[in-house]
Amino acid sequence: SEVEYRAEVGQNAYLPCFYTPAAPGNLVPVCWGKGACPVFECGNVVLRTDERDVNYWTSRYWLNGDFRKGDVSLTIENVTLADSGIYCCRIQIPGIMNDEKFNLKLVIKPAKVTPAPTRQRDFTAAFPRMLTTRGHGPAETQTLGSLPDINLTQISTLANELRDSRLANDLRDSGATIRIG
């Protein structure tokens, strides 16, 4: 059965997925799809990487971590109830039937009113935002520093990401990592 993850409407959802590259920069293709993993590849692909870079993504879906170190966890921006469901993370390790596949269940809850933190600088420093556009990439991505027009929802979302990043580290420490090579 799938591991379950939760997020609130309007926030960013975080779906963890990791592997350990055999050597730095020795990446393997990864795909993320909406729906359970099929027999090969991913269905309804929302993002994919190749041996070098993120080479396909759709709006609202991005990799927040350092995918070059094997952190291919998916962030879904500004989620709605329609984002609920199963997501597939498939790590396409070369060889004969070597793929590692993970089905993750995302449950979206209605939004709660959360008090907004007063200082945005700390959040943007900890979590620089990646701007991407829909398309076949790899388009140039820009890392933004302080955003003057950042809203309260984004700030509380970043606060949640800070909290969730500890969960990601716990996950990594608990051995939920695929080691290659």
């Epitope: 293709p29 099929p38 027999v39 269905g43 309804n44 692909v45 390790i93 070597n98």
Partner: antibody
């Protein structure tokens, strides 16, 4: 238009080997997964092997896993199936097929005309 | 491996009829089911993927439905060129498996 042309079939004795080829044209070969599917004399379809677009990942059912090897040459737009330790139950029409995957995995959206393999003493 | 039980094996029909072929998966396969048409002496031709999405160029009279374990291919207003064998396939888990086929014949 998309074309897939298999070749290399024939009559072979049990325990023998055979290499099938599939020449692809009309599409960017290196942008697709590719598969081999066979159809037995009683018309049943059986999946035989699949290979990723780069050739780095391969997939087989248990029935052929240690005997068949799928490979590809993207420079030559050609798919291969090396078959060894052939058995009478491998007798079938062998089809190569194209598998789109980039935005959504879809199995076998184009098939070749097939090449017949008969395993008999 | 997942068994795809396809029924019926044979079906007699007349031009203009509406017919349905069913496939039952032995395990949950989500909507990862495809349907293929094969005419005598030809290779299979794809009709449907993701249980209900028609391939480009497939006439609207071919409709796929279902999810989980039960799937149906419906041909409304059967035409003479539809007389063929139809196969379902699941591509949810390895090995990818096919149904045994349904032969559509004229009454």
């Amino acid at each position: 238009q998309v074309q897939l042309q298999e070749s290399g079939g024939g009559l072979v004795k049990p325990g023998g080997s055979l290499k099938l080829s599939c020449a692809a044209s009309g599409f960017t070969f290196s942008s697709y997964y590719m598969s081999w599917v066979r159809q037995t004399p009683d018309k049943r379809l059986e999946w035989v092997a699949t290979i990723s677009n780069s050739g780095g990942s391969t997939y087989y059912p248990d029935s052929v896993k240690d005997r068949f090897t799928i490979s590809r040459d993207n420079a030559k737009n050609t798919l291969y199936l090396q078959m060894s330790s052939l058995k009478s139950e491998d007798t079938a029409m062998y089809y190569c097929a194209r598998d789109p995957y980039y935005t959504n995995y879809v199995p076998m959206d184009y098939w070749g005309q097939g090449t017949m393999v008969t395993v008999s003493s | 491996s997942i068994v795809m039980t396809q029924t019926p094996k044979f079906m007699s029909t007349s031009v203009g009829d509406r017919v349905s072929v069913t496939c039952k998966a032995s395990q949950y396969v989500d909507t990862y089911v495809a349907w293929y048409q094969q005419k005598p002496g030809q290779s299979p031709k794809p009709l449907i993927y993701s249980a209900s999405t028609r391939h480009t160029g497939v006439p609207a009279r071919f409709t796929g439905s279902g999810s989980g374990t039960d799937f149906t291919l419906t041909i409304s207003n059967v035409q003479s060129e539809d007389l063929a064998e139809y196969f379902c396939a699941q591509y949810s888990s390895s090995p990818l498996t096919f149904g045994a086929g349904t032969k559509l014949e004229l009454k």
